[in-house]
Interface confidence: low
């Protein structure tokens, strides 16, 4: 996905504006691509990404990718179409309102990814196991 902040301003200088909130209107996501991160050994982290973007396509959701190797930790925040794989993985949790990190198998690094479908939901990434789809409270939030 082309970073949508290149194409569309998200400040008050827009000619007109966004979201009466109708179905499949483009999502608002944090979109800083890959940046170094200090997020480590925490139940949850903020992205520290200052760019909120209107996703380029109405079907796109918010995605965050946390990676740790011997040298550094990075956090990637983007919009992405859940019908397409990202980093070779399917976005299984795209309908979730919260970005619940799940570990994926990648050689030579620790790799977590999450996706979600509420505005700026990839700003707060959650690693804690208490948040999962067997949690009735989370299901209530998703399907209310």
């Amino acid at each position: 996905t082309i970073p949508p902040h290149v194409q569309k301003s998200v400040n008050n200088d827009m000619i007109v504006t966004d979201n009466n909130g109708a179905v499949k209107f483009p999502q608002l996501c944090k979109f800083c691509d890959v940046r170094f991160s200090t997020c480590d050994n925490q139940k949850s982290c903020m992205s520290n990404c200052s760019i909120t973007s209107i996703c380029e396509k109405p079907q796109e959701v918010c995605v965050a990718v946390w990676r740790k190797n011997d040298e550094n930790i990075t956090l990637e925040t983007v919009c992405h179409d859940p019908k397409l794989p990202y980093h070779d993985f399917i976005l299984e949790d795209a309908a979730s309102p919260k970005c619940i990190m799940k570990e994926k198998k990648k050689p030579g690094e620790t790799f977590f990814m999450c996706s979600c479908s509420s505005d700026e939901c990839n700003d707060n990434i959650i690693f804690s196991e208490e948040y999962n789809t067997s949690n009735p409270d989370l299901l209530l939030v998703i399907f209310q």
Epitope: T17, K24, A95, V141
Partner: antibody
Framework: EVQLVESGGGLVQPGGSLRLSCAAS????????MTWVRQAPGKGLEWVSV????????YYADSVKGRFTISRDNSKNTLYLQMNSLRAEDTAVYYC???????????????WGQGTLVTVSS | DIQMTQSPSSLSASVGDRVTITCRAS??????LNWYQQKPGKAPKLLIY???SLQSGVPSRFSGSGSGTDFTLTISSLQPEDFATYYC?????????FGQGTKVEIK
């Protein structure tokens, strides 16, 4: 049960100011973008403004840009619309509405308040 | 801005009638169209989203169809509580825009 209750409407002179509030209950307020939509007497619906769940991103219709300010207090589950430099053409019922969060699941502006009337007249 | 044009602007019908309201967009909006019902003195109510999906709790006599620029709201058998004004709204591009409304009155 989802409820949205607007308040703060009334009669104001041209050039004056008014602050509308919308108290929300029955849902997780801070993950929903919230909008204001207005309807002039006997007329159709006009979208006014939206604010993202965190409050970090806001947008306005051309007709109100620079005069209206949308904000929210997530600790109080309340949405606001500060209206300055009011004009006669701003006279309308103002509705706050919840943006349907899950674009493939729910969609649409699915819950609306009952509206509050703003009358701008000398 | 995308212009939304509804027709007719008003219609008279009887209980039990099949009623059809059309909405035309000034450019293609795929299936990103919603229908709302509004009764006098009340807030709008979402009926149909994504052109043809029925919102939870809405009676099955309401249905929507169409794609691209031409859309239809159909009430298969008009009930007394259906006399109201109906609005279409596109959600394809900014700003979201509404049609001018169709008032359904008792014949």
């Amino acid at each position: 049960e989802v409820q949205l209750v607007e308040s703060g409407g009334g009669l104001v002179q041209p050039g004056g100011s008014l602050r509308l509030s919308c108290a929300a209950s029955g849902f997780t307020f801070d993950i929903y973008a919230m909008t204001w939509v207005r309807q002039a007497p006997g007329k159709g619906l006009e979208w006014v403004s939206v604010i993202s769940g965190s409050g970090g991103t806001v947008y306005y219709a051309d007709s109100v840009k620079g005069r209206f300010t949308i904000s929210r207090d997530n600790s109080k589950n309340t949405l606001y619309l500060q209206m300055n430099s009011l004009r006669a053409e701003d006279t309308a019922v103002y509705y706050c509405a919840r943006r349907g969060q899950y674009r493939d699941i729910a969609g649409g502006t699915d819950y609306w308040g009952q509206g509050t009337l703003v009358t701008v007249s000398s | 801005d995308i212009q939304m044009t509804q027709s007719p602007s008003s219609l008279s019908a009887s209980v039990g009638d099949r009623v059809t309201i059309t909405c035309r967009a000034s450019q293609s909006i795929s299936s990103y169209l919603n229908w709302y019902q509004q009764k006098p003195g009340k807030a709008p109510k979402l009926l149909i989203y994504a052109a043809s999906s029925l919102q939870s709790g809405v009676p099955s006599r309401f249905s929507g169809s169409g794609s691209g620029t031409d859309f239809t709201l159909t009430i298969s058998s008009l009930q007394p509580e259906d006399f109201a004004t109906y609005y279409c709204q596109q959600s394809y591009s900014t700003p979201p825009t509404f049609g001018q409304g169709t008032k359904v009155e008792i014949k």
